[in-house]
Interface confidence: low
């Protein structure tokens, strides 16, 4: 914004009636009327160009300073060229000197010197030639002085003439502010501009109505250089919630639309699921039976929990369980959705049932699973378990109904035991198994079955209450398949996975070496 | 030397409308912000609005934001009231009053301002 | 808005007395703060801005103090000319807020 100009002294504007002094008295500068363009104007003019030295001050009338820290002076004068005299006139001049001096108070017709301080000496661009003097044509100078600081309540200027042929057609005094100004949303006040030219003021700016510093952000505030100009704003105001920028103003969001927090962005229309919102709206709030999680942002459409899996199956495999289920079909509109697993089992004999979390084991854990099937082992034989899938997203803890489906399942065989070869000879093999043990006080005996590969006509049964046993009376260097089966009192559990064990040859005998 | 003369109040009924006229002389109107302050029958003063020197920025009162809009014509040195949806409460002398900041000797001005000039006033009735 | 409370309402006092008006501020208003003189009919005229800045023309008697939230305007001899009703006023903000004034009336 360009500087504004606080005029304290125009000498053109005044008609002649300023009356400033001049020394010596009636002699020297003079106040001359003269027609320029069709119109008077006055003018203080001395031309003593042939009277040896001269010494002639023209002073002005006390100017208040006021809030001016640094005065601009222009001056519009004239200077004839001393060539155009007759003789060259030896003592003539073509500058003057200017002036100033402070004081508190009006001196009045006081006049000294020795208190007045030369700001510079003015010399013209173009001196008015003998030619233009005659045509009328006066050459027109402008020059611009400032000084400053000022510190006291007033001040004069002076014009020493030492010789020269000049006219002073105008004298402005003035001093610059930074207008009034509204940038970034902030209001600046009209400030007067500083008296050093490297240093700018700094001005405080004020939020327009509805607007704010954003949090962390800085306090406007811009700088108000020596020439009046607004330079290195800093800082700004946003338009707070429920508030947008229109051209230097925050106008309130208009029904159906709302602004979450003081920003640069425009108000938002009232997402999906929302109510609309009255003017000035800060968020729209959530049709019935859909709702907002805390972490939700405002602009985010309102949801619902979700349907429950769409489709659940359980797959027996002896003593685990393979679940699988299809997400829901009605997501709720967002995609948080996880699943919980939870379990049940049930004895046959006596129908009691009790949550069976803790004794069985699940191949990830079975709360906040993101992918859609989970393995259930060390389940009991002989045992109903029923297993609930549920499905959540971020706003199912704001309502108290479940999303669930569940399958059941009867468990009627033990695990497989799980067999390894401990040792071999070359006319024996030790074999051991486990299994899990909630299953193992089920078991009432184990089974081994044996025979030699390749021969499907013939095989041998050891039975054992043990976890292991030594199979005798085999045939070196032989491969034997064998297989381990637990037997419950209900019947045969599952039957191991049928291994292959080769006894040792008779030259590398070293008895039950691995 | 300042002057400022009000015209254009009268009685008027509520819902009605009325234009206040201040005209400026004696000084560089331009240069002047420029503000409209009411008086209620046997009550204080109140400010309702302000213009700045070129038309803006401009401020209202909460009691006439909406209803009242002040405007001004530097050409012809004349600052405007235009008052809409008049109530009863509205009823005051209504004072156009200035401000030149080249008066205002501070470092910096004020956040607003004052009013160093001030018209004759113009009375407003709002009656059935 | 910004709140102004001038106290008294009516004070009565003869020529030659020294007067004292207070102004509160229902906030810190720094010394934004400017007193006028009403007589009745009249509009209001302009004593004393920036607090303590005695306005082109205003005689010396008058004079101001204050800052934050408390403000004093002084007549320090009451004269003929002086009996009228004296308003404060902020200009801090935006609302500029007058005072509810105080009548000097004649003792």
């Known amino acids: 914004a360009q500087g504004k100009e606080v005029v304290l002294l125009d000498f053109a504007a005044a008609g002649g009636e300023l009356g400033w002094l001049t020394h010596p008295y009636g002699k020297g500068w003079d106040l001359m009327q003269n027609i320029m363009n069709d119109m008077p104007i006055y003018m203080y003019s001395v031309c003593n160009v042939m009277s040896g030295d001269q010494d002639n001050w023209l002073r002005t009338n006390w100017v208040y300073r006021g809030e001016a820290e640094r005065i601009f002076i222009e001056l519009k004068f004239t200077v004839r060229d001393c060539n155009s005299f007759p003789g060259g006139a030896s003592s003539c001049k073509e500058t003057f000197n200017l002036y100033y001096a402070e004081s508190d108070l009006d001196y009045g017709t006081n006049f000294q010197k020795r208190l007045f301080t030369k700001i510079d000496t003015i010399a013209p661009d173009e001196i008015t030639v003998s030619s233009d003097f005659e045509a009328r044509h006066v050459k027109l100078n402008v020059e611009e002085r400032s000084v400053g600081p000022l510190t006291r309540k007033g001040f004069y200027l002076a014009f020493q003439d030492i010789g020269a042929c000049v006219a002073l057609l105008s004298v402005r005094v003035y001093y610059k502010k930074c207008p009034e100004l509204l940038q970034g949303l902030a209001h600046f006040p009209e400030t007067i501009a500083g008296s050093d030219a490297p240093s700018l003021a700094t001005v405080a700016g004020t939020c327009v109505d509805h607007a704010v510093v954003p949090p962390g952000g800085e306090e406007p505030r811009m700088h108000c250089a020596v020439d009046g100009e607004w330079l290195v704003p800093i800082g700004q105001c946003l338009c707070q919630a429920g508030y947008e920028k229109v051209e230097d103003a925050c106008q309130a969001c208009s029904p159906g639309f709302f602004k979450f927090e003081a920003s640069e962005s425009p108000c938002l229309e009232c997402p999906e699921h929302t109510l609309p919102s009255p003017e000035g709206a800060t968020s729209c709030e959530c049709e019935e039976g859909f709702f907002r999680a805390p972490q939700d942002p405002a602009s985010m459409p309102c949801t619902r929990p979700p349907s429950a899996p769409h489709y659940l199956t359980a797959v027996g495999m002896g003593a685990k369980v393979e679940l699988r289920w299809t997400p829901p079909q009605d997501s709720g509109g967002r995609e948080d959705i996880v699943y919980s697993v939870t379990c049940e089992q049930c004895w046959p004999e006596s129908g009691e049932c009790g949550p069976c979390e803790a004794s069985v084991r699940y191949s990830e854990p079975p709360h906040g699973l993101t992918r859609t099937s989970v393995t259930v082992s060390d389940l009991e034989p002989h045992m109903n378990y029923t297993f609930t899938v549920e499905a959540r997203n971020g706003v199912s803890g704001l309502v108290t109904s479940r999303s669930f489906r569940t399958a059941s399942v009867s468990i009627n065989q033990t695990e497989p035991p799980k067999v390894r070869l401990e040792g071999r000879s070359t006319t024996s093999l030790s074999v051991s198994w486990s299994i899990p043990p909630p299953q193992q006080s089920r078991v009432w005996k184990y089974e081994v079955t044996y025979r030699k590969k390749g021969d499907s006509n013939s095989y041998n049964v050891r039975r054992t209450e043990g976890f292991s046993v030594t199979l005798d009376d085999l045939a070196p260097d032989t491969t034997y398949l064998v297989q381990v089966q637990a037997l419950t009192q209900e019947g045969q559990g599952a039957g191991s996975k049928v291994h292959e064990f080769q006894t040792l040859s008779p030259e590398g005998s070293g008895n039950l070496a691995v | 030397e300042v002057q400022l003369l009000e015209s254009g109040g009268g009685l008027v009924q509520p819902g009605g409308s009325l234009r206040l006229s201040c005209a400026a002389s004696g000084f560089t109107f331009s240069h002047y912000m420029m503000a409209w302050v009411r008086q209620a029958p046997g009550k204080g003063l109140e400010w309702v609005s302000r213009i700045g020197p070129s038309g803006g920025p401009t401020h209202y009162a909460d009691s006439v934001k909406g209803r009242f809009t002040i405007s001004r014509d530097n050409s012809k040195n004349t600052l405007y009231l235009q008052m809409n949806s008049l109530r009863a409460e509205d009823t005051a002398v209504y004072y156009c009053?200035?401000?030149?900041?080249?008066?205002?000797?501070?470092?910096?001005?004020?956040?607003?301002?004052?009013?160093?000039?001030w018209g004759q006033g113009t009375l407003v009735t709002v009656s059935s | 808005d910004i709140q102004m409370t001038q106290s008294p309402s009516t004070l009565s006092a003869s020529v030659g007395d020294r007067v004292t008006i207070t102004c509160r501020a229902s906030?810190?208003?720094?010394?934004?703060l400017a007193w006028y003189q009403q007589k009745p009919g009249k509009a209001p005229k302009l004593l004393i801005y920036?607090?303590?800045n005695l306005h082109t023309g205003v005689p010396s008697r008058f004079s101001g103090s204050g800052s934050g939230t408390e403000f004093t305007l002084t007549i320090s001899s009451l004269q003929p000319d002086d009996f009228a009703t004296y308003y404060c006023q902020q200009y801090n903000s935006y609302s500029r807020t007058f005072g509810q004034g105080t009548k000097v009336e004649i003792k």
């Open positions: 009053a200035g401000y030149d900041s080249g008066y205002d000797y501070v470092a910096v001005a004020g956040p607003a301002e004052y009013f160093q000039h």
């Open positions: 906030q810190s208003i720094s010394t934004w």
């Open positions: 920036k607090a303590s």
